[in-house]
């Protein structure tokens, strides 16, 4: 099982969670495996049980503390190991020295709400969740709007190159149902990636006023 292609990828949410995915071709589905975290300058260790997410991949979340507590800094290195039970002992399958602030993936933005809606425009706001104060304003956002008859993949991406937790959508069609999503990414970190997309926010533009040329 060890000789198949193996990948062990983890991301830090910038506060108190490291999420890991381990994939291993030819690994036994019913094998009991876990991720163990051993920081280089902290007194705590943490373990999570890997649970199957597909035929050959497993995932788990290392919960390091209260959701908004700052458990790691830019100087921390956490040795992460995948351990799988083989008979009476645990065997190390994968290992890495994890630099949390080089491998960031924030939580999806939350609390999306329509601030103001008109016939052709809609102002939407949101909040970021469990994001470190270390970033200050060094965040960027991507947003997309789902129009009738289209898919999310077809929706053009709107980029906000600063920490701006609102957007004014223009050139919308009156009396039309839309959905909106946003995601966030810190500017810091060589392997940092976008957060998951937020839950979609559904809204409807106002109908055009009768007798008015819109």
């Amino acid at each position: 099982a060890v000789n198949g292609t193996s990948q062990f990828t983890c991301f830090y949410n910038s506060r108190a969670n490291i999420s890991c995915v381990w994939s291993q071709d030819g690994a036994l589905q019913d094998t009991s495996c876990q991720v163990h975290a051993w920081p280089d300058r902290r007194r705590w260790n943490q373990t999570c049980e890997l649970l199957p997410v597909s035929q050959a991949s497993w995932a788990c979340n290392l919960i390091l503390g209260a959701p908004d507590s700052q458990k790691l800094t830019t100087v921390d290195i956490v040795t992460l190991r995948v351990l799988c039970r083989e008979g009476v002992r645990w065997r190390v399958m994968a290992i890495q020295d994890f630099k949390p602030f080089e491998n960031l993936r924030l939580m999806a933005p939350i609390s999306l709400q329509v601030v103001h809606v008109e016939t052709h425009r809609c102002n939407i706001s949101w909040e970021i969740s469990q994001a470190s104060h270390y970033f200050e304003r060094h965040l960027e956002f991507e947003a997309r709007t789902l129009s009738p008859g289209h898919t999310w993949e077809e929706a053009p991406l709107l980029t906000l190159k600063q920490k701006q937790e609102w957007i004014c959508l223009e050139t919308l069609t009156p009396d039309t149902q839309y959905e909106f999503q946003v995601r966030v990414k810190p500017l810091q970190g060589e392997f940092t990636t976008w957060s998951p997309w937020s839950q979609p926010l559904a809204f409807r533009t106002k109908p055009a006023a009768l007798g008015k040329d819109t």
Epitope: V92, A94, I95
Partner: nanobody, 126 residues
Framework: QVQLVESGGGLVQAGGSLRLSCAAS????????MGWFRQAPGKEREFVAA????????AYVDSVKGRFTISRDNSKNMVHLQMNSLKSEDEAVYYC???????????????????WGQGTQVTVSS
Amino acid sequence: QVQLVESGGGLVQAGGSLRLSCAASGSIFSINAMGWFRQAPGKEREFVAAISRSGGSTAYVDSVKGRFTISRDNSKNMVHLQMNSLKSEDEAVYYCAATAAVGWTSRWITTDFDSWGQGTQVTVSS
């Protein structure tokens, strides 16, 4: 299964040098990293040095940095530990170890390794 055989141990004066070698055989295709550990009487086995499959990454315990050098000869399935400026505290049984674990760390521990040699004694006289 991987078989490991150490050689090169012996008696050396303090300040002297010694070169340990480890020959690997068997399922060597599964080896990702190899390392050296040592165990003095009454003490726990401790990490000394490790090297990646390609030889591009190495790690050492602080107490041997600048004195010991680990190297790898993949064509001969050998790993070497060149030990210079030996001290009395370097006296121990030295074990070669191999792991199939994918990836790399600078903080190896004994349980990371699944194949072990029988060990070779290094004695440092003053």
